[in-house]
Interface confidence: low
């Protein structure tokens, strides 16, 4: 902790500017008024303060706002955000998407830190739901964000937000998460025509029930094997050989290469050998 010392004559800061980089830590503590700092936070990032000097500036803000910083200060924290602990951030009430973007920008290119995770959690919980603009922003910065949420958290995603989801945002989602997201996607894309609908829904199909797969098999969708392999085993098992053939179209030949893997293996074991033989792939039930 920096000792309280009087500010030397003539060194009292009238504004936040480059002259402060020559101040020692104790001079910053003594000569920079915390309220002045708070109102001119936007200038701090343009000044090449050392990490030690930033510690002093953070300390001054902490003293001025022991209950947590106001959003007007948070929005302009810039690199000072990297000095915050999750404990600091839990005191904040961030409601503006612009503030969230400004802070995510500071951390851009790095993995999601506990500070950022706490910030996002505060922001989303404060809004009450993960709306489209927020999801758009978060997945732009962190493509894996959606799959880092629990099924319970995903349940607060409104169907309208699903339009912001890109296929790569779902790469690391597990079946429990897709179970929650699929019905929302189905609702979001329900007014699209067949081929367009399939392009949009494809990434979410790991959460699709049997009846939806049966319906898709009637629409000449030509599902690729990568998508088929991600389907729920319990949803695939009741499909007939004819339905799988229609679902996969020209990709049906790929079943041979996947015959030892779930869900193909389990599905093959469920089928009559006569039916499998109609595929001409040499699959053995």
């Amino acid at each position: 902790e920096v000792e309280k010392t009087a500010c030397p004559s003539g060194k009292k800061a009238r504004e936040i500017d480059e002259s402060l980089i020559f101040y020692k830590k104790w001079e910053l503590e003594a000569c920079v008024d915390a309220a002045l700092l708070a109102t001119q936070m936007d200038r701090v990032n343009a000044i090449p303060f050392t990490y030690e000097q930033l510690d002093v500036l953070k300390h001054k803000l902490d003293e001025l706002y022991p209950q947590g910083y106001p959003e007007s200060v948070i929005q302009h924290l810039g690199y000072l955000f990297l000095k915050m602990s999750p404990e600091d951030i839990r005191k904040w009430n961030v409601t503006s998407l612009e503030t969230l973007k400004a802070l995510l920008e500071v951390n851009k290119g790095h993995e999601m830190s506990p500070q950022v995770a706490t910030l996002i959690d505060r922001f989303v919980k404060g809004r009450g739901q993960l709306d489209k603009d927020t999801l758009d922003t978060l997945t732009a910065f962190y493509p894996g964000y959606l799959c880092s949420l629990s099924p319970e958290e995903l349940s607060s995603v409104p169907p309208s937000s699903i339009w912001a989801v890109r296929p790569q945002d779902l790469d690391t989602c597990d079946p429990r998460q897709l179970d929650v997201l699929y019905p929302k996607a189905r609702l979001a894309f329900q007014n699209m025509n067949g081929s367009e609908y399939f392009v949009k829904i494809q990434s979410f199909l790991g959460g699709a029930p049997t009846e939806d797969l049966k319906a898709l098999s009637q629409q000449n969708v030509s599902m690729d094997l990568a998508t088929f392999m991600k389907l729920r085993t319990d949803a695939v098992l009741p499909l007939t050989v004819a339905e799988v053939q229609k679902l996969l179209g020209p990709h049906v030949e790929g079943l041979k290469a996947e015959e030892r893997h779930r869900p193909v293996r389990d599905w093959i074991l469920r089928q009559r050998q006569d039916d499998l033989d109609t595929l001409g792939l040499g699959l053995q039930g």
Partner: nanobody, 119 residues
């Protein structure tokens, strides 16, 4: 009321190591963001490290980064603080804290374990 229990403190020479443990009997550590704090005699309590429940990511105060490591064993509902290259200025009472990972969540503290580092 949940009670966290710290252990593993003790006396050690500068440069030595200790591993602190924090258990929450009857409570799942996966429900918590887990923090370690410390308080040296006559000083304010200061944050040392955090481990988030959501994705297991970790964070450290500048004064301990590179020397301390926070981790957890979900099977035992125990959170650890591995402290290496200890310095005399690390001497303090160490506390663990569980912040129930919810908006405006409850938090729970342990009674602390003392770490003394002599030069």
């Amino acid at each position: 009321q949940m009670q966290l229990v710290e252990s593993g403190g003790g006396s050690v020479q500068a440069g030595g190591s200790l591993r602190l443990s924090c258990t929450a009997p009857g409570f799942t550590s996966s429900d918590c963001d887990m923090d370690w704090y410390r308080q040296a005699a006559g000083n304010q309590r200061e944050w040392v490290s955090s481990l988030l429940s959501t994705d297991g990511s970790t964070s450290y105060a500048d004064s301990v980064r590179g020397r301390f490591t926070i981790s957890k064993d979900p099977a035992k509902d125990t959170v650890y603080l591995q402290m290496n290259s200890l310095k005399p200025e690390d001497t303090a009472m160490y506390f663990c804290r569980c912040v129930v990972a919810e908006w405006g969540g409850m938090d729970y503290w342990g009674k602390g374990t003392l770490v003394t580092v002599s030069s």
